[in-house]
């Protein structure tokens, strides 16, 4: 049994890091493998992650972590029984994938303005709370070409757009994702999408 693709890990910079790797053949990850991880810190304790299958030869492990900060560095040991298959390290702050924003809501009761709001996925005491920027994706269910991205570079988790920038009388969906420049993160996953029917009063044309 050998590791074909070494584990790569990303952290949500809060409580979970996810590591993925591939074996050289079909593997029952949860029964055959264990990923041991330990913070390189005084008094830290070793933890064991039981991996799950991620495709025939792929494995994924969700590592639980406390009080993640930029100084943290973890040792990782991948075991198959008594055999050490791979040894490495992981610094969560250097591989951050933020949590996805939640509670995306479209408020259509403001006069001819769409207000989209969502929740910051981090608590106020987490460093990322004040450092997330967002991308909002809006698309038409009827017209695949009607697909747009709005970059939200301010801290407030909201976006206002004129309803008239979208077509009237059809349904739209929206979703939002986040990233943080300070840690050069990857983008988060998209939030679950929300749907609304876009309708607004066309202004009378003057002749």
């Amino acid at each position: 049994m050998k590791v074909l693709q070494e584990p790569t890990c990303v952290s949500d910079y809060m409580s979970i890091s996810t590591c993925e790797w591939k074996m050289n053949g079909p593997t029952n990850c949860s029964t055959e493998l264990r990923l041991l991880y330990q913070l390189v810190f005084l008094l830290s304790e070793a933890h064991t992650c039981i991996p799950e299958n991620n495709g025939g030869a792929g494995c994924v492990c969700h590592l639980l972590m406390d009080d993640v900060v930029s100084a943290d560095n973890y040792t990782l040991d991948l075991w198959a029984g008594q055999q050490l298959l791979w040894k490495g390290s992981f610094k969560p702050s250097e591989h951050v994938k933020p949590r996805a924003p939640g509670n995306l809501t479209v408020h259509t009761n403001v006069s001819d303005t769409l207000l989209l709001t969502w929740s910051n996925p981090y608590p106020p005491d987490n460093y990322l709370y004040n450092h997330l920027t967002y991308a909002v994706n809006i698309w038409s269910e009827n017209d695949p070409a009607d697909f747009r991205i709005y970059n939200v570079t301010y801290l407030e988790p909201s976006l206002r757009i004129a309803a008239s920038t979208l077509k009237s009388g059809i349904s739209y969906r929206a979703r939002v994702r986040a990233w943080a420049q300070c840690y050069n993160t990857t983008w988060s996953e998209w939030s679950p999408s929300t749907k609304w029917h876009n309708s607004y009063r066309e202004p009378f044309e003057q002749h």
């Epitope: 005084l42 830290s44 009080d67």
Partner: antibody, heavy 116, light 111 residues
């Protein structure tokens, strides 16, 4: 919000021991290390030691080895610092402070006076 | 005694800028991150800067931190009378056993 509530002031005689408590609330108690830091009157901050509340393991500053004991009670989310063989130089305010590499939150402090 | 050295005192007028230095060595500041604490008279210390230059939620951006080599600096702009306090740097040292040294402390007087 995070709160670290410390026990009240103590007056002790030289040679005696003192046990200071620090009750934590507003966060997951076992997820954060706890430090103890003291400050003698008019002096600076002095680190004494650290405890991992999850397993109870400890590490102490060399200066206090053999005299200090840190413990925790997870059922009450409380950490304790006991200092023995007290001398007058141990008169200080003793603080508990939550954190790993740095101290996010501090208790208000417990004044321990050692006097004959 | 502390292995991190700070000036005993600094002073400046309201609205001015002040910097406080913290000098250490390769086994502490040179190999770790620096934090700064503010201690107002008669109160417990409060975390002001961590990770060399990050501010906890609620700390105004008048406070800034930087690190270069084995030294660190705390900067305070737009001084206010309420900033009058003792300031301590802190880090951790892994040269022999893990320890958390603090700086000698700096008394800031707002004139």
């Amino acid at each position: 919000q995070v709160q670290l509530v410390q026990s009240g002031a103590e007056v002790k005689k030289p040679g005696a021991s003192v046990k200071v408590s620090c009750k934590a609330s507003g966060y997951a108690f076992t997820s954060y290390y706890m430090h103890w830091v003291r400050q003698a009157p008019g002096q600076g901050l002095e680190w004494m030691g650290i405890i991992n509340p999850r397993g109870g393991s400890t590490s102490y500053a060399q200066k206090f080895q053999g005299r200090v004991t840190m413990t925790r009670d997870t059922s009450t989310s409380t950490v304790y610092m006991e200092l023995s063989s007290l001398r007058s130089e141990d008169t200080a305010v003793y603080y508990c402070a939550r954190g790993k590499y740095w101290m996010y939150d501090w208790g208000k402090g417990t004044l321990v006076t050692v006097s004959s | 005694q502390s292995v991190l050295t700070q000036p005993p005192s600094v002073s400046a007028a309201p609205g001015q800028k002040v910097t406080i230095s913290c000098s250490g060595g390769s086994s502490n500041i040179g190999n770790s991150y620096v934090s700064w604490y503010q201690q107002l008279p008669g109160t417990a210390p409060k975390l002001l800067i961590y990770d060399n230059n990050k501010r906890p939620s609620g700390i105004p951006d008048r406070f800034s931190g930087s690190k270069s080599g084995t030294s660190a600096t705390l900067g305070i702009t737009g001084l206010q009378t309420g900033d009058e306090a003792d300031y301590y740097c802190g880090t951790w040292d892994t040269s022999t056993v893990w320890e958390w040294p603090f700086g000698t402390g700096t008394k800031l007087t707002v004139l």
